[in-house]
Interface confidence: low
Amino acid sequence: VPRLVLSDLHLLTQSQVRVSWSPAEDHNAPIEKYDIEFEDKEMAPEKWYSLGKVPGNQTSTTLKLSPYVHYTFRVTAINKYGPGEPSPVSETVVTPEAAPEKNPVDVKGEGNETTNMVITWKPLRWMDWNAPQVQYRVQWRPQGTRGPWQEQIVSDPFLVVSNTSTFVPYEIKVQAVNSQGKGPEPQVTIGYSGEDYPQAIPELEGIEILNSSAVLVKWRPVDLAQVKGHLRGYNVTYWREGSQRKHSKRHIHKDHVVVPANTTSVILSGLRPYSSYHLEVQAFNGRGSGPASEFTFSTPEGVPGHPEALHLECQSNTSLLLRWQPPLSHNGVLTGYVLSYHPLDEGGKGQLSFNLRDPELRTHNLTDLSPHLRYRFQLQATTKEGPGEAIVREGGTMALSGISDFGNISATAGENYSVVSWVPKEGQCNFRFHILFKALGEEKGGASLSPQYVSYNQSSYTQWDLQPDTDYEIHLFKERMFRHQMAVKTNGTGRVRLPPAGFATE
């Protein structure tokens, strides 16, 4: 621990002190530096502030002091392992008072009522007071008058100037003052007395239709004298007329855009085509918004949204019925539908497309399809602007040709039954096929149960009268051709148990 000794002539001047100390034990790691700290027991007891660091081979330094601080010093030695224990503290040195060297910063003037101005600033830290107390000399005058300054000395970090006119610019100065004098000549800040609601009404220059869902709105800059405050910008509010449902208690949904003060146009996008809109533009300041200029406009027709809920219904091996609902968003007057389709495994070749010119149409029958192919069907509604977004479905009339046509086929078993389940494909024609359960093992002699006729649409089949604890092969036939095989084993003891609820049996 370094032993701190203040030299006899410690105060070299009123603002400098010489501090010396005896070297610290280095404990086999050289002292790299000494940190000289001070505490002011009057203003900030128990808080130590660094005044500076000096190299480890130095045992004294001259420190620059601030006015009116009760300095108590200590020194800490630092080596590569970190700081040691601080030295005992010195006697207290009190520097003489002096006039402030700094003024408050962050000076602002703004009204919180229409007829006042509140002047605020960041108070000086105690280290900058240079005396036991500090006050603030606040000066103000209307900008541009070059007339006399009004002034007041206050202790609080604010001053309310009352009885001002609405939104007048003021020159403001705030200077630190203590018993020894004043701080530097303060910088002039411009503040404003309180704002009132704007009286300016933006004058609309016009609305340019960009497309069926976007418009450009333009207006003339407002007269700043009518803003009664700092123009912060413009509030643009718009809503679709007739968007309030009849007998609905819900409010009309209004959209808002805030436009900066230096901009006098805005693009409104995401509008619904073929709709009437109401528009309001208001100037606003810190107090609020002024009166609105109003306008109505209509968006032109656009392309419609996608048709709803396209279903495929198999009519025969070669024909499908398409069934749909019209789009939720017409975006204009519907003129009909466009239907396109192509076989999936032909790489998009062979696409057929035709117009259905009846907007009231909800179904269409397709014939001459190949029974062995899957198709991609695409349906679009149309307005005079053209076809809209498509709804897409895949399917076909194809006859069963392997396990993939069943989708997720599985079998489970109880003691004397087995349930075979599958997921029918949408658009697949219903057909009938055989299921055959064949017992395995020597003692069973490979006995088969009678083949059962099953409908594809029923999605499951339960086979009863099986032997407990027996392996079965399940064979699926269609038109006497073997299509699929799977295996299942029944449970133990032969007690009869019912299958789970909800399974169809034949």
């Epitope: 006039a99 602002k108 004043k182 910088q187």
Partner: antibody, heavy 118, light 111 residues
Amino acid sequence: QVQLVQSGAEVKKPGASVKVSCKASGYTFTSYWMHWVRQAPGQGLEWMGNVYPGSGSTKYAQKFQGRVTMTRDTSTSTVYMELSSLRSEDTAVYYCARPGNYEGFAYWGQGTLVTVSS
Amino acid sequence: NIQLTQSPSSLSASVGDRVTITCRASESVDSYGSSFMHWYQQKPGKPPKLLIYLASNLESGVPSRFSGSGSGTDFTLTISSLQPEDFATYYCQQNNEDPWTFGQGTKLEIK
């Protein structure tokens, strides 16, 4: 009106020191910070530091710390800038400058050319 | 240290032209609701002259064809219609943070 008048040109050898003065008039000398800015030939402006005549407080740019000293004499309303251990790259015009009522250096001295040459 | 980068470094223009000089700071120079950025004009052999203080305020006695704008890190000095006496070097300067720093300068020459 505010006036800042600087001392005349100096020629110094490397390693020497130079002391430039700036005499202020037309305002309350102790109320405004005074700054020093230098400009090497054909180069831009470089802030060196400042001094507050009211108390003698100083603030120096890190680059000049240890080589520059700024002082004031309130009896003659003069500030001084002393630069030691001169090198050839210290050849420059040295300006004193004072902020206006708002911000920015509104008032400048006429400049002092310091030439460092062996 | 806050670095200030001016662009362009030099430009040629004619009397009557509108000229824009930009200054980009390596970090924000905004504090207390103000932008501590200033613009100066300097002619050969003369000290700099303050044109714009606090980003957008015209110094007393400076012609209104000079204007400043910007906040945070991006600032612009605009001369709306060049006059013969405007051909000079222009500097931006910040004093939001020590050390106070200047841009490298933009030399405006006659075309």
